[in-house]
Amino acid sequence: ESALITQQDLAPQQRAAPQQKRSSPSEGLCPPGHHISEDGRDCISCKYGQDYSTHWNDLLFCLRCTRCDSGEVELSPCTTTRNTVCQCEEGTFREEDSPEMCRKCRTGCPRGMVKVGDCTPWSDIECVHKESGTKHSGEVPAVEETVTSSPGTPASPCSLSG
């Protein structure tokens, strides 16, 4: 069991680090950054950089921190109260229907289409027909048919697939 030391057990010069603190549940729940003990009487801190909890809870265990995959960059590290924030590298994006991996953005639009949206970490470039303005979701065009684009940089939290 992690962090079973109470503050009172220690001399002033040996005070436990924040991740070792233990407290009592409030109305049966423990605060963010903690999980409940086996007997339900104590709140035990999550381990910084290893696991976390984001809400008041009665969880037996803190949740494992996400580890950013290769092809992702870490925007913010895991704390005891917040999961790691990962983002696809420049030029790649994560689709909602395949959140476990970053895919390469298309480099441009097919002939007869114009780019109306940049590559972002969560979306491919967006192309529309010049005349009708309807969106295109076809295959990646040949190089001579492309209009190049530059990737965007906004951030998005990553999925829970360490």
Partner: nanobody, 124 residues
């Protein structure tokens, strides 16, 4: 998604031992807390034991404390339940489950994945 397959059940005499295994495939096993539940004939599902993602923290129901030991081997994607001093009342179908965590009463937190179960019969 995680697929779970239990094994190791069987017929054992009172006082005997069994070791159940739960083999996982699919997404990263080590991301999940794991647990064992059981369902005795004609009864509801009972939370037996649980273990956190790295095996450091464990939970046991009062009915099995001191007799059962839960463990996991993340390198083998396998969860175990060592059952000693078995009693007739331990007779049940044992299920393993994976979830991000489990609440104090045993309720899985987030999406839960379940095995098909393995039958343990304790009888002389």
């Amino acid at each position: 998604e995680v697929q779970l397959l239990e094994s190791g059940g069987g017929l054992v005499q009172p006082g005997g031992s069994l070791r159940l295994s739960c083999a996982a495939s699919g997404r990263a096993f080590s991301n999940y807390a794991m647990s064992w539940f059981r369902q005795a004939p004609g009864k509801g599902l009972e939370f037996v034991s649980a273990i956190n993602w790295n095996g450091e923290n464990r939970y046991y129901a009062d009915s099995v404390k001191g007799r059962f030991t839960i463990s996991r081997d993340n390198s083998k994607n396998t969860l175990y339940l060592q059952m000693n001093s078995l009693r007739a009342e331990d007779t049940a179908v044992y299920y393993c489950a994976a979830a991000l965590s489990f609440r104090l009463g045993g309720e899985p937190y987030g999406d839960a994945y379940w095995g098909q179960g393995t039958l343990v019969t304790v009888s002389s």
